[in-house]
Amino acid sequence: MKVLQEPTCVSDYMSISTCEWKMNGPTNCSTELRLLYQLVFLLSEAHTCIPENNGGAGCVCHLLMDDVVSADNYTLDLWAGQQLLWKGSFKPSEHVKPRAPGNLTVHTNVSDTLLLTWSNPYPPDNYLYNHLTYAVNIWSENDPADFRIYNVTYLEPSLRIAASTLKSGISYRARVRAWAQCYNTTWSEWSPSTKWHNSYREPFEQHHHHHHHHHHH
């Protein structure tokens, strides 16, 4: 039994790091393998992760961590019974994939403005809480070409857009994801999408003089 692709890990910089690897043949990861991990620090204990299968020869393990600081370094040992298959280390702060934002809501109660809000996936004591920026993806269910991304580079988890920038009378979906420049993270997964019906009334003057204006965006 050999490791074909060495473990690579990403951290949510809060409580979970996920490591994936491939074996040289079909493997029952949970019965045949164990990934031992230990924070390189005083009093730290070794922990055992039981991997799950991820395709025929692939394995994935979710390493649970109490907290994380920038300087953290973990030793990783992959065992098959008494045989050490691979030994490595992992610095969570160098391989961060943020948690996905949640609770995406579209507020349509102001006729000419759409307000999208979502929740920061981190608690205030986490460094990433004040360092996330977001990308909001809005698309039309009717028209695949009507697909847009808004970059939210301020810290507030919200986005205001004029309803008139979208077509009226059709359904749209939105989703949001996060990243943090400070740790050069990858993007998070997208949040679950939310759906709304876009309808707005053009001002009378605009309707009278520029009836087709909004079709030209």
Partner: antibody
Amino acid sequence: EVQLVQSGAEVKKPGATVKISCKASGFNIKDTYMHWVQQAPGKGLEWVGRIDPTNGYTIYASKFQGKATITADTSSNTAYMELSSLRSEDTAVYHCVSRRPWFAYWGQGTLVTVSS
Amino acid sequence: DIVMTQTPLSLSVTPGQPASISCRSSQSIVHSNGNTYLEWYLQKPGQSPQLLIYKVTNRFSGVPDRFSGSGSGTDFTLKISRVEAEDVGVYYCFQGSHVPYTFGQGTKLEIK
């Protein structure tokens, strides 16, 4: 041996500023969060705030926001807390504590007395 | 802020007898990562506090096994199975799950 050694007792006048230090040995402060805890005379423990020494990220209890400023110097392995606009109510013992992820190591405490 | 309320505030126990201290949080202290960071500290007279129990039930290294922690949700308990003279001092519960972190008001244990 792991130790947190704090600077000595201070007596200050109201309105003054004091900066107390906490030097760690036996471990690197970059590997922990460094916290400060207040203990007023004859009273209990109150959490002041904390710092991640590597990136300087601080959080404070609202009571100490604007009153306490926590800093760290990783080259000297030392954490600091500055208390400004001192009042008699700030008279207390202040403990530095390393947390990873519990308060395993405490400094001996620094008594700050505010008196005119 | 989460308020940690300890009862009783003082306790007088005969050596060899058990002691129990209760700590109630004003709301759940389960962290977003699923862990409950409820700890117990003992401050002996003239000393800095020392860690006894972390994550509700785990004894810190070197802590005698007569100390045990239990509880979940918002109700937690520290038990000393047989009190010894060296156990005197003030016991504090602490929650490190939600900012601002908070201590209980302390329970003073003395020997009869």
